[in-house]
């Protein structure tokens, strides 16, 4: 997260980290006791899922292995459209005050809505500095028309843009798959942005979760 600050303790109980061994790979969100939602570009063969603590490496955190993951069938490694994936935990997460399910959206929030993006990704770019504590930054949703003015043909349907004019505030490497939460519901998953991160007036691009609630629910049902 660029130009952010540590999240208020326990304010993101649905936030998870996907680890490769002990190393941060991506962010994600807990959908229910068995399922994590993340970005399709975060695909690995096996995951260790960190839940229940804002601090990576915290011994009190839950750590659950996951071996099965289901990318959206329309995901493209070329255009990064449909950049979402469900990861099935090998054992159930224990819900608590620090481990809660995210609220999936029942509607798409409009441009101008203030949202929070969070993650353990690098706080500097292009040189990397990985924080141990979960970082947050507030950004505003940007209309597809305004975002297309910036990214032209790089932008596809079901991609959502967010940022702050003339500001560096943005997600970055390591935040991928993590949540963009607006008015208490999950509206985006960190997908991509300009590198180095934090170029002023280059918004962050997110997978627009409100367009995929049916696929999310159908996929969890299908692979119960």
């Amino acid at each position: 997260i660029i130009d952010g600050a540590p999240c208020a303790r326990g304010s993101h109980p649905w936030q998870v980290a996907l680890l490769s061994g002990n190393q941060l790979h991506c962010g994600g969100v807990l959908v229910n006791e068995r399922w994590v939602l993340t970005a399709a570009h975060c695909k690995m063969n096996e995951y260790t899922v960190h839940l229940g603590s804002d601090t990576l490496g915290d011994r009190r955190a839950q750590r659950i292995k996951a071996s099965k993951s289901f990318r959206h069938p329309g995901y493209s490694t070329q255009t990064h459209v449909n950049d979402l994936m469900l990861v099935k935990l090998n054992s159930q997460a224990r819900l608590s005050s620090m481990v809660k399910k995210v609220r999936l959206p029942s509607r798409c929030e409009p441009p101008g809505t203030t949202c929070t993006v969070s993650g353990w990704g690098t706080t500097t770019s292009p040189d990397v500095t990985f924080p141990s504590d979960l970082m947050c930054v507030d950004v505003k949703l940007i209309s597809p028309q305004d975002c297309t003015k910036v990214y032209k043909d790089l932008l596809e349907n079901s991609m959502l843009c967010a940022g702050i004019p003339d500001s560096k505030k943005n997600a970055c490497n390591g935040d991928s798959g993590g949540p963009l939460v607006c008015r208490g519901t999950l509206q985006g998953l960190v997908s991509w942005g300009t590198f180095p991160c934090g170029q002023p007036n280059d918004p962050g691009v997110y997978t627009q979760v409100c367009k995929f609630t049916k696929w999310i629910n159908d996929t969890m049902k299908k692979h119960r």
Epitope: T77, H80, P196, N201
Partner: antibody, heavy 122, light 107 residues
Framework: QVQLQESGPGLVKPSQTLSLTCTVS??????????WNWIRQHPGKGLEWIGS???????YYNPSLKSRVTISVDTSKNQFSLKLSSVTAADTAVYYC??????????????WGQGTLVTVSS | DIQMTQSPSSLSASVGDRVTITCQAS??????LNWYQQKPGKAPKLLIY???NLETGVPSRFSGSGSGTDFTFTISSLQPEDIATYYC?????????FGGGTKVEIK
């Protein structure tokens, strides 16, 4: 189809400043998600990235050349430029301008100019 | 800086042969690895990006694989027009760096 064209003097005297301009057509230099780069190739040798500039004006330089390099952009003319000061014979090379798709997920040089040979000699 | 070690520096093969070039990064670069073809007197041309994605319009006989530190570029059936120098390039960190190149010739 994006096209890039380098222009500038082919001969520069030692200790002077090498100046090149890259004119972009078929695409806007102010598009987000791309960087505009200078890369050079010494005669018979490999490729060396010199530096890049973004639509925002942010610049990034190779540390090995940083003290001598300035890259600037003129969005109104859809051009970007390279200045390399205090040149020596070791700066004799073919200089390429190139566009990079440069995202957190993917980064590569997709369009290149044809290159211009700059010789440093008195 | 990340060092890119490419091998071999040159090779000679017959038309129709399978040609393999390797590239090793001095540290983990995930899949931020690209391959370019350069013909004499011309600018480099992108063939493969993100280690394994074929650039639009590039023949399918070209392919790439690998992640982390070890990468491979393959021409499944060498054609006369493939005579060129091939470069790998890492895009994980600035400054972006290139391998030393592999010159491919026809026997």
């Amino acid at each position: 189809q994006v096209q890039l064209q380098e222009s500038g003097p082919g001969l520069v005297k030692p200790s002077q400043t090498l100046s090149l301009t890259c004119t972009v057509s078929g695409g806007s230099i102010s598009s987000g998600g791309y960087s505009w780069n200078w890369i050079r190739q010494h005669p018979g040798k490999g490729l060396e990235w010199i530096g890049s500039i973004y639509r925002s004006g942010s610049t990034y330089y190779n540390p090995s050349l940083k003290s001598r390099v300035t890259i600037s952009v003129d969005t109104s003319k859809n051009q970007f430029s390279l200045k390399l000061s205090s040149v020596t014979a070791a700066d004799t090379a073919v200089y390429y301008c190139a566009r990079a798709k440069q995202l957190t997920l993917t980064r590569y040089f997709d369009y290149w100019g044809q290159g211009t040979l700059v010789t440093v000699s008195s | 800086d990340i060092q890119m070690t490419q091998s071999p520096s040159s090779l000679s093969a017959s038309v129709g042969d399978r040609v393999t070039i390797t590239c090793q990064a001095s540290q983990d670069i995930a899949n931020y690895l690209n391959w370019y073809q350069q013909k004499p007197g011309k600018a480099p041309k992108l063939l493969i990006y993100d280690a394994s994605n074929l650039e639009t319009g590039v023949p399918s006989r070209f392919s790439g694989s690998g992640s982390g530190t070890d990468f491979t570029f393959t021409i499944s059936s060498l054609q006369p027009e493939d005579i060129a120098t091939y470069y790998c390039q890492q895009a994980s960190q600035l400054p972006f760096t290139f391998g030393g190149g592999t010159k491919v010739e026809i026997k």
